[in-house]
Amino acid sequence: FERTRSLQDPCSNCPAGTFCDNNRNQICSPCPPNSFSSAGGQRTCDICRQCKGVFRTRKECSSTSNAECDCTPGFHCLGAGCSMCEQDCKQGQELTKKGCKDCCFGTFNDQKRGICRPWTNCSLDGKSVLVNGTKERDVVCGPSPADLSPGASSVTPPAPAREPGHSPQ
């Protein structure tokens, strides 16, 4: 019975971009400006997201899909669907409550977002440090000391840090 009723429900014929208008005898009406319905059979249209302030429009709202926001330069997205914008820091830094702070010795951040992470522990994998870490770069692990030919130097100085490093995603 439920299935039969749903097949007879006139609202089920209303496609995305429309809503089933109870005030007009359940006729499918187009979504009003600045609203959308992404699925068929909707009884209302949803209000479009507005990208204001630190948010900027990545994709305009259409009758069938919501607007999508990203962040203005100097900020990056956080949360599902870019629900927040967070300030960028420089490589070699992390964002704290007091602003951008340099990574402590033994940690690095090769992006403009996120936290300072400890350098990789190469010995965990039986490897040795091939290139030293910096505030901006992780170490590069190399073969275990036993794999090195006699007299070969195992550690390379770090490559000079350059901008741009890992781009904010």
Partner: antibody, heavy 119, light 107 residues
């Protein structure tokens, strides 16, 4: 030895979703980045994104930001990639990879999972 | 994104030949350049990392050189088992990007 074993081939209809798994063994799962890489038929390799399982921090290639969701389950040492709203151009082999010790190279590759999108 | 231009796209050589593949980055990537081998069965293996470092267990006939934007991968004496497609990849900047690949065949 270090191993990444991926789930089997999938055939999906357009508009559907698929979740590919990558089970890691032979190392401390939480200490290395897991990457996902796409190879469309007859094409080259494209980096989709990665995850650091210790805290589930992710990076995405902007191109795949609305397509792929990467997650990790520390309790089973398994990484996942879910692809949504599948289209024919998502037909490809998807690889998971582990870094070599620091994120800058990929030392271990899974065997690949073929995802076919066809109506 | 950093573009990686790999050449040639295909190459036919004889057993024992010296084979060279080049990879050019659209901007300076320091030494964060890796080379991978993809066999016909689709298995992928890291051969060289950080421009010139040979992965443990990889035969010494494989080598790499370069820095900045220009990189070279060499097989000093081609063996039948080297039939594969070879890819370069930059690990300097997200998103990581690959060259288009070089398909190597035996004459």
């Amino acid at each position: 030895q270090v191993q990444l074993v991926q789930s089997g081939a999938e055939v999906k209809k357009p508009g559907a979703s698929v979740k590919v798994s990558c089970k890691a063994s032979g190392y401390t799962f939480t200490s290395y980045w897991i990457n996902w890489v796409k190879q469309a038929p007859g094409q080259g390799l494209e980096w989709i994104g990665n995850i650091y399982p210790s805290d589930s921090y992710t990076n995405y290639n902007q191109k795949f930001k609305d397509k792929a969701t990467i997650t990790a389950d520390k309790s089973t040492s398994t990484a996942y990639m879910e692809l949504s709203s599948l289209r024919s151009e998502d037909t490809a082999v998807y690889y998971c990879t582990r870094d070599y010790g620091s994120a800058y190279s990929m030392s271990t590759w899974g065997q690949g999972t073929t995802v076919t999108v066809s109506s | 994104d950093i573009q990686m231009t790999q050449s040639p796209s295909s190459l036919s050589a004889s057993v024992g030949d010296r084979v060279t593949i080049t990879c050019q980055a659209s901007q300076d990537i320091s030494n964060y350049l890796n080379w991978y081998q993809q066999k016909p069965d689709k298995t992928v293996k890291l051969l060289i990392y950080y421009t010139s470092r040979l992965r443990s267990g990889v035969p010494s006939r494989f080598s790499g050189s370069g820095s900045g934007t220009d990189f070279t991968f060499t097989i000093s004496s081609l063996q039948p088992e080297d039939i594969a497609t070879y890819f370069c990849q930059q690990g300097d900047t997200l998103p990581y990007t690959f060259g288009q690949g070089t398909k190597l065949e035996i004459k």
